[in-house]
């Protein structure tokens, strides 16, 4: 008779990604006996919290905590009961809360307090709710992508750990309120704030990262809307035949639209705005989001921000993926080159509302925003970050790797639970045959 060996015990970790537009819960799992291996932590399950992001509860902080209950109840079912007490639970808030913290620090604190109160009611090992810096958001996204793709170290067939020759992948994240670019670089940073030194599995990494607040998709759309209200009686990025009533208070309440805010305006006034399907005017409107007039360093991306030349391959996830996937899949347009990406954006911006609805059935009003989104992504990559055709060829648009969502959440948990050691594993991987 043969002994049947039981599968190794699993450990679990939970991260709540409190984004600007919504909150997602990710539950990760890994074999308890392989904690220091790479690529061993994977996504067990996930849950989207209904409603808006926690920053939208500024006037009702307790509602922020209450909104998480449904997903936390799912976590109670998804994580085995005997593992509850040993499962770390984290909440990280990003640019939506960074913006709220800028404009109303008291409300920001109240929201985090309310969320903390809810999370402590559950039997998990709650380890805090906090606002991540833009730098952390960028770096942890980069760690997630490279961990999942096993770019740090790999376990070879001869039973040895080795560092893959392929190098690391840059990471580009487009959220609702901010966007991040992070990549390994050989040149020292001219701006210390944009450089992060990491030691992972005994290897040293010099990483460039920058987060642009107000350059997330939702805030960009609000800024474009504010510009359209200011300079046109129509919205060039919206399709002809589409019109809606815009509440001025909604447009101008964001700190991101402060530059376009009139000195006096009626916040409860509703203005009717129609689309004009004008790709050239839309491009001009999007161009106005980027400033290239001054650069205090040897080179900059935009708005006077230092950036070394983009190097190596990149993974572009979150709204980068959703935007490009829409062009590729829903619209059936090629997007393999920058030229094709630009042509695809122009194509979408040329569509009337009737044509767009026929191409993409069953859709809500956000369908009208894909033109602006596509124009923004194209300009951000080409003019903003300086991708040329050759560099763009090394960009993959993907939302998952190894069946796990790419984003900052996994990297954050790996860091806080020390699942990536600074020093390399032993030369030979220990195998217990007892």
């Amino acid at each position: 008779t043969r002994d049947i060996r039981e599968p190794p015990a699993l450990k679990y970790g939970i991260v709540l990604d409190a984004g600007s537009s919504h909150t997602s819960m990710f539950i990760y799992k890994w074999p308890a006996d392989k904690e220091n291996d790479t690529g061993i932590v994977g996504q067990h399950s996930s849950c989207d919290v209904p409603g808006g992001g926690i920053s939208s509860y500024a006037d009702n902080p307790s509602g922020a905590g209450q909104s998480l209950v449904g997903c936390l109840e799912q976590a109670l079912r998804d994580v085995p009961k005997e593992r509850h007490a040993g499962t770390p639970l984290y909440l990280g808030a990003t640019a939506g809360m960074r913006l709220l913290n800028l404009t109303n620090p008291e409300a920001s604190t109240s929201v985090l307090t309310a969320v903390t109160h809810t999370l402590t009611q559950y039997p998990f090992d709650f380890r805090g709710a906090r606002i991540l810096s833009g730098q952390e958001e960028g770096v942890f996204g980069w760690v997630t992508a490279n961990y999942l793709l096993e770019n740090f170290i790999k376990y070879g067939w001869v039973g040895r750990w080795f560092r893959p020759r392929k190098g690391t992948l840059g990471a580009m994240d487009l959220g609702g309120a901010s966007t991040q670019i992070t990549f390994e670089t050989t040149s020292p940073a001219e701006d210390r704030a944009s450089e992060v030194q990491l030691r992972l599995y005994g290897q040293h990494y010099r990483v460039y990262t920058h987060s642009f607040l107000c350059y997330g998709r939702d805030q960009v759309l609000q800024r474009l809307l504010a510009s359209a209200l200011q300079t046109h009686s129509f919205h060039p990025c919206w399709p002809r035949g589409f019109s809606t009533h815009v509440l001025l208070g909604d447009v101008y309440q964001s700190p991101c639209t402060v530059a376009q805010r009139p000195q006096t305006f009626n916040s409860s006034a509703r203005v009717s705005l129609s689309g004009s399907s004008d790709p050239h005017l839309c491009r001009d409107l999007v161009s106005g989001l980027f400033s290239f007039s001054s650069c205090p360093f040897s080179r900059c991306s935009f708005n006077g921000v230092f950036q070394p030349p983009v190097a190596g391959n990149f993974i572009a996830f979150s709204a980068f993926f959703y935007t490009v996937n829409f062009l590729r899949t829903s619209m059936g347009l090629p997007v393999a080159t920058l030229q094709q990406l630009e042509a695809a954006a122009v194509n979408v911006c040329n569509q009337t509302w009737a044509q767009l609805q026929a191409r993409v059935p069953g859709q809500q009003a956000h369908l009208a925003d894909y033109c602006a989104g596509a124009m923004f992504v194209q300009q951000l990559l080409s003019r903003g970050y300086g991708f040329d055709e050759r560099a763009f060829g090394g960009v993959i648009f993907q939302k998952k790797a190894a069946d796990t969502a790419v984003g900052w959440a996994l990297g954050y948990m790996l860091n806080l639970t020390n699942l990536i050691p600074a020093d390399p594993p032993g030369l030979r991987k220990g195998t217990d045959f007892s």
């Epitope: 989207d48 209904p50 899949t329 009737a354 026929a358 993409v360 059935p361 069953g362």
Partner: antibody
Framework: QVQLVQSGAEVKKPGSSVKVSCKAS????????VSWVRQAPGQGLEWMGR????????RYAQKFQGRVTITADESTSTAYMELSSLRSEDTAVYYC?????????????WDQGTLVTVSS | SYELTQPLSVSVALGQTARITCSGD??????VYWYQQKPGQAPVLVIY???NRPSGIPERFSGSNSGNTATLTISRAQAGDEADYYC???????????FGGGTKLTVLG
Amino acid sequence: QVQLVQSGAEVKKPGSSVKVSCKASGGTFDSYAVSWVRQAPGQGLEWMGRIVPWLGFTRYAQKFQGRVTITADESTSTAYMELSSLRSEDTAVYYCARESPGYRYSFDVWDQGTLVTVSS
Amino acid sequence: SYELTQPLSVSVALGQTARITCSGDAIGEKYVYWYQQKPGQAPVLVIYDDNNRPSGIPERFSGSNSGNTATLTISRAQAGDEADYYCASYDLQQARWVFGGGTKLTVLG
């Protein structure tokens, strides 16, 4: 009142192809789209693909990609669905359904369907 | 890939209220459509855009959609409501219509 009228039942051999037609009587395809949905015996509904005749735009479900071709003849207000490399699992009732802008291009008018039997 | 999950069957007493659910990740952010199919017949649209009824569909049929669940509600159920009900939504990421597996509604009594 627009009605859809499909071609008659078909019996096909494995490996062969079938082409089903769907004619809009009492109307045209102007501003409409047509989807093809199939239903195997005792099973649920399965979307195969769609065409927007006035835009010449088609999309197919990944499962049928390369095996299904949807076309339309605007002059006769007829849509066609051709499925190749037939296998026994393709035995089903094939429906054409009109997608209407009034219902956000969901399926507001269906025909009674065409039974396709694949058997050796 | 995006999936919609429905209960295989739901029973309701004659004249009572039947509720058929359709669950999917963040389905509340999408529009949901409901189809009724009687044996040997083609499906019929009974609810569009979450909660709207096409002309000719009785007021007894209503829909709701939020979070991860959409619901078709049939009040004062009648024998003629016995049928299979399918929810559907458009999956933007894969550019395809997705149907739920269908729910067989049985009206008792």
